[in-house]
Each structure stands twice: as C-alpha cells, then as structure tokens.
C-alpha cells in the first residue's frame, strides 16, 4: 500500500525525522511547517492547527526558514568609514564593509562592525605585506640600496638609480643623485639626469570611529521521535 | 540547508574523557542556536546541552552540570562537547540539532539533525 502523505501537523513515525521546511515543535511534540526566508511565526503550532506565519515588518529579516516568534532586526546604517555592499529587504540583514583605503578591525557575523584607515609607511620604510580587507598594512625599512620618500599605504622599497658618479649618496628615504653624467640606468637621450619627483600619494585619514551598534533549567524532553539513521533532514 | 555530521564517540572507562564534534555543512551554523541531544537504548530524548544563537547563553541538563562543556568554533563551523568524567549511564547515541535564531535554551523545537555518534562508557 503506498504511504499516506501527511499534512501538518502530524506526530512523526518512531525512528522518523519531520520532512525538509518541517521541525519537531517540543510543546505540541509534532511536525510542524516553518516560515519562509522573509516571514516569522505568527501564532505556533498546537496538535490540531499548524504555524500560521506573518511577514517581516520593515527593518527585520529571515534569512532561514524558521519559527522565531519576531524577525531580527537589520543592523544600524553603515558609518562614514564603509559602504553598503547589502541593503536590508525582508530576507537579508544590512551588510557594511571597508571603503577603500580602510580595513575590518573587528568583524561580526557577515560584514564589518569597526573599520580603521590602513597604516602608512612613512618615508625610509616600504611596505612589506599590503592591507587587505580583514589586515592592515605592514611596514619594514628600506634594505641598503633602496629607498621609499613617500608616506603610502602601498609605496614599497624601491632600488636607488646606479650613478656613473653620485653627487648624492643615496639613503633609506633618498634616491641618489647623479652628476651630470649619465647613470647606468637607462633614460631617454636629452632628458634631465635627476630622480624624478613621486607624489605622495597620501589618502586624508579620518579618526577611527566608534563601532556600530548591530543589531534553565535541566528537563527530559518527551517522547520524541528517534533522530534519523542516515541523511538529516530540514533546513 | 544545514547538513550536521557529528564524530568523536567511541568506548571510552567510566572516568574517562571524549570530545564530539558536530560539523556543519551548507550554512553557517552561527544563525542557528544549537543543542546536543542523546538517546540511550529504550529511553526518551534527552537534550544535553544547548547554545543560542548568539553564543551568549549555554544550558546543562542537571546529569551533566559540572562535566560536560558545550563550544562552538563559527570560524570552523563546529560545535563541540567536552565529556569529562564519564558515567555508565552516559551510554546513548548523541546528536547535534539545530533551531534557526533560537535565542533561548532548552531548543523550542528541533530542525535539523545528524546521523548521530555512539558514545559507551563500560570498564
């Protein structure tokens, strides 16, 4: 005989789990249906009537198929330092994350709760690990032979120009200075044999702000079902 | 769709130590309070211990105050239970399940289940 469907609620089989979108409700001690991504529980199940589910009210979300009582509420709006890469809708919390320039000192659940403005390498010291999203920059001096005269984020060390005759020795903040005689270093005929200027291309820093705000007994339980011998089941 | 494959038990002398794990697939098991339960042959569930949601609340059985430590590691996506000074009557297949947001322990409600590990605590 093929096996009657059963409709929600109904008490599981011993040694059975509740269906996919179902859960084992531990008052009514049966199967009941969840709410969608974007609902919540209106009114729990009982062991004649099933869970009546109601929409997110503005500013909260589901995610998961669920029976919370009330949705969550979406996180604060995001702070000067960050960008909204995800708006709150019903089903999807607020996501924050780094502007550029900027990196998550403290993470939460999904996005940035505090971003901080990446080190700059003052001059004399170049940058030996790039900032990432989650990490800051790392500095390191200039070994003998290279030089950075930049305050950057992402200036690393680079070689002094090789000089037939040097005026000016070059130093950990300093290229060399050539005499009007050519350098090794190959330039175009008739140009000026002096180190070209760098820009500094400082990014403005801004202090770091303050973090946004995100958003028992002991007991046996009741008879219940037996948990499933193979694959899980719900969501 | 949360899928949880628990490991860790064993046969293991009373006064002895395990440690299960629960390994979460699918999605990220910090949206879900989540509890572990054990059956032992011919008895009801029990729900041994719980986390919320947000980590910030835990909950013991009477049995197991004292012995037994629930943690979750979100960066792993794994929820463990430390069982020290094991008794006889430990004996009981544990599962780990799941309650989306669950804020509160014990769970209102189960979701998701695993397979389940056999723990035996026998000299």
């Known amino acids: 005989l093929p096996a009657q469907v059963a409709f929600t609620p109904y008490a599981p089989e011993p040694g059975s789990t509740c269906r996919l979108r179902e859960y084992y409700d531990q008052t009514a001690q049966m199967c009941c249906s969840k709410c969608s991504p974007g609902q919540h529980a209106k009114v729990f199940c009982t062991k004649t009537s099933d869970t009546v589910c109601d929409s997110c009210e503005d500013s909260t979300y589901t995610q998961l198929w669920n029976w919370v009582p009330e949705c969550l509420s979406c996180g604060s709006r995001c702070s000067s330092d960050q960008v909204e890469t995800q708006a709150c809708t019903r089903e999807q919390n607020r996501i924050c994350t780094c502007r550029p320039g900027w990196y998550c000192a403290l993470s939460k659940q999904e996005g940035c709760r505090l971003c901080a403005p990446l080190r700059k390498c003052r001059p004399g010291f170049g940058v030996a690990r790039p900032g990432t999203e989650t990490s800051d920059v790392v500095c390191k001096p200039c070994a003998p032979g290279t030089f950075s005269n930049t305050t950057s984020s992402t200036d690393i060390c680079r070689p002094h120009q090789i000089c037939n005759v040097v005026a000016i020795p070059g130093n950990a903040s300093m290229d060399a200075v050539c005499t009007s005689t050519s350098p090794t270093r190959s330039m175009a005929p008739g140009a000026v044999h002096l180190p070209q200027p760098v820009s500094t291309r400082s990014q403005h820093t801004q202090p770091t702000p303050e973090p946004s705000t995100a958003p028992s007994t002991s007991f046996l339980l009741p008879m219940g079902p037996s948990p499933p011998a193979e694959g899980s089941t719900g969501d | 769709e949360v899928q949880l494959v628990e490991s860790g038990g064993g046969l293991v002398q009373p006064g002895g130590s395990l440690r299960l794990s629960c390994a979460a697939s699918g999605s990220r098991l910090d949206y879900y309070a989540v509890a572990w339960v054990r059956q032992a042959p011919g008895k009801e569930l029990e729900e041994v211990s719980c986390?919320?949601?947000?980590?910030?609340?835990?909950n013991y059985a009477d049995s197991v105050k004292g012995r037994f430590t629930i943690s979750r590691d979100n960066s792993k996506n794994t929820l463990y239970l430390q069982m020290n000074s094991l008794r006889a009557e430990d004996t009981a297949v544990y599962y780990c399940?799941?309650?989306?947001?669950?804020?509160?322990?014990?769970?209102?409600?189960?979701?998701?289940w695993g397979q389940g590990t056999l723990v035996t605590v026998s000299s």
């Open positions: 399940t799941t309650e989306p947001y669950g804020s509160s322990c014990p769970l209102s409600g189960y979701d998701t």
């Open positions: 986390i919320t949601y947000s980590g910030g609340s835990t």
